[in-house]
């Protein structure tokens, strides 16, 4: 019908506004994995900006895989309508203001700003140049406008965005909107080794964040998590060379709050940073 046609026109148009998602895995391509099962699953398509069906093989793959359309929408579309209305009308901080400072796993040394929920202020930190999370602003002003409370204790409303009702996307109206295609979410480098559910005994490596080294483990052949590498070199390249090595070189800036656990977040950025 005409409504479908209208929506199709919008989602295939290259003038779609910048998009910001909570989880990086929403940007991953659907990955059916190497196994041969035929399982109906859903993934978020960053280009159509919709959750779509795909056939999953039953093992491996990536995190952009959901059992239901509802789960996919919940994880990847951010319920933009409700969130923005809440943010702009009720003066609440966006969720990402409460994320911990996260330098990412690359080895740049870029000054950025994050909102420190303990001090209730925006503070400077050193960003590695890739990955990280949404609590990451290019300027102090931008951080303050989005995350700090105003003089009366209200959130300063500087989102400067309008909701596009047709495709539930945000149209930028000012420079307050962070850059295009920054995707943010959990990484796997700090998750424990997970054998998975099958019965194979494959030699794999996982990153042990406690000792800061890649260690071998036996993988069952299916399931598990993404802290799972076929070679030690691959494991080191993905987890150690960026994040842990930067810590050992004193690359992180100290903040006033205690950090229970350094969480690595994956983020596809519209910026490209080479692994040096």
């Amino acid at each position: 019908d005409s409504e479908e046609d209208e929506e199709h026109t919008i989602i295939t148009d290259t003038e779609l506004p910048p998009l910001k998602l909570m989880h990086s895995f929403c940007a991953f391509k659907a990955d059916d994995g190497p196994c041969k099962a035929i399982m109906k699953r859903f993934f978020f398509n960053i280009f159509t900006r919709q959750c779509e069906e795909f056939i999953y093989g039953g093992c491996e793959g990536n995190q952009n895989r959901f059992e239901s359309l509802e789960e996919c929408k919940k994880m990847c579309t951010r319920d933009n309508a409700n969130r923005i209305i809440k943010t702009t009308l009720q003066q609440e901080k966006p969720d990402f203001c409460f994320l911990e400072e996260d330098p990412g796993i690359c080895r740049g040394y870029i000054t950025r700003y994050f909102y420190n929920n303990q001090t209730k202020q925006c503070e400077r930190f050193k960003y590695g140049g890739c990955l990280g999370n949404m609590n990451n602003f290019e300027t102090l002003e931008e951080c303050k406008n989005i995350c700090e409370d105003g003089p009366n204790g209200f959130q300063v409303d500087n989102y400067g965005t309008q909701l596009n009702a047709v495709n539930n996307s945000l149209t930028p109206q000012s420079t307050k909107v962070p850059s295009l295609f920054e995707f943010h979410g959990p990484s796997w480098c700090l998750t424990p080794a997970d054998r998975g559910l099958c019965r194979a005994n494959e030699n794999r490596f996982y990153y042990n964040s406690v000792i800061g080294k890649c260690r071998p483990f036996k993988y069952s052949g299916c399931g598990g998590n993404e802290n799972n590498f076929t070679s030690k070199q691959e494991c080191l390249r993905a987890c150690k060379k960026g994040f842990i090595q930067r810590i050992s070189k004193g690359g992180l800036i100290k903040t006033k709050r205690k950090r229970k656990k350094q969480r690595v977040k994956i983020a596809y950025e519209e910026i490209f940073v080479k692994n040096m």
Epitope: T14, E15, D31, I46, F47, T139, P178, L180, I271
Partner: antibody, heavy 118, light 107 residues
Framework: QVQLVESGGGLVQPGGSLRLSCAAS????????MHWVRQAPGKGLEWVSN????????NYADSVKGRFTISRDNSKNTLYLQMNSLRAEDTAVYYC???????????WGQGTLVTVSS | DIELTQPASVSVAPGQTARISCSGD??????AHWYQQKPGQAPVLVIY???NRPSGIPERFSGSNSGNTATLTISGTQAEDEADYYC??????????FGGGTKLTVL
């Protein structure tokens, strides 16, 4: 309608400098990452550099690192590429392009020719 | 960086189907994009995200990506489709990369 117009190209001697500009219109310039891509005569496309939406993060191809500097002025809706220590192999048409998802450039300028020759 | 390989040239008769390949290590795990460039002109995006067509691009252009190869397909090729075609992709932590380009000749 989105428009990107490059300028500043020309003939320069090896070791010389040039500054390219790209004037943007028809979209919210300050919300988009921008890129320079070049094409040597008769050759393929080569990504050169990019800059984040507010200008604080930049990246370069190995072939130009340390010699080229990308910048932007959001108040003027303009992207720049300062090219120093130019070499013969930098001879190319330089395009500015609007960046979307990595590797995906949805709008391109018509290009400006830079010729490095003695 | 990922390396993308394209055939230097492809020829097709008018009205026939042209297929241009772009191969790279595990390319299926990355999004592939395609650009058309006519002599003396800037590149134009014709396919993005493997198989999405920007507005204004004719329906005869389509794309696919599986295994190590992305393919641009032009059904019912017309004389005006004669051009150079470039694929591009991006591998996490590196730079955007273009294939070497394919010259499409409409016989």
């Amino acid at each position: 309608q989105v428009q990107l117009v490059e300028s500043g190209g020309g003939l320069v001697q090896p070791g010389g400098s040039l500054r390219l500009s790209c004037a943007a219109s028809g979209f919210t310039f300050s919300s988009y990452g921008m890129h320079w891509v070049r094409q040597a005569p008769g050759k393929g496309l080569e990504w050169v550099s990019n800059i984040s939406y507010m200008g604080s993060n930049t990246n370069y191809a190995d072939s130009v690192k340390g010699r080229f500097t990308i910048s932007r002025d959001n108040s003027k809706n303009t992207l720049y590429l300062q090219m120093n220590s130019l070499r013969a192999e930098d001879t190319a048409v330089y395009y500015c392009a609007r960046g979307l998802f990595p590797g995906y450039f949805d709008y391109w300028g018509q290009g400006t020719l830079v010729t490095v020759s003695s | 960086d990922i390396e993308l390989t394209q055939p230097a040239s492809v020829s097709v008769a008018p009205g026939q189907t042209a297929r241009i390949s772009c191969s790279g290590d595990n390319l299926r795990s990355k999004y592939a994009h395609w650009y058309q460039q006519k002599p003396g002109q800037a590149p134009v995006l014709v396919i993005y995200g493997d198989n999405n067509r920007p507005s204004g691009i004719p329906e005869r252009f389509s794309g696919s990506n599986s295994g190590n190869t992305a393919t641009l397909t032009i059904s019912g090729t017309q004389a005006e489709d004669e051009a150079d075609y470039y694929c591009s992709a991006y591998a996490m932590g590196s730079s955007p990369v273009f294939g070497g380009g394919t010259k499409l000749t409409v016989l």
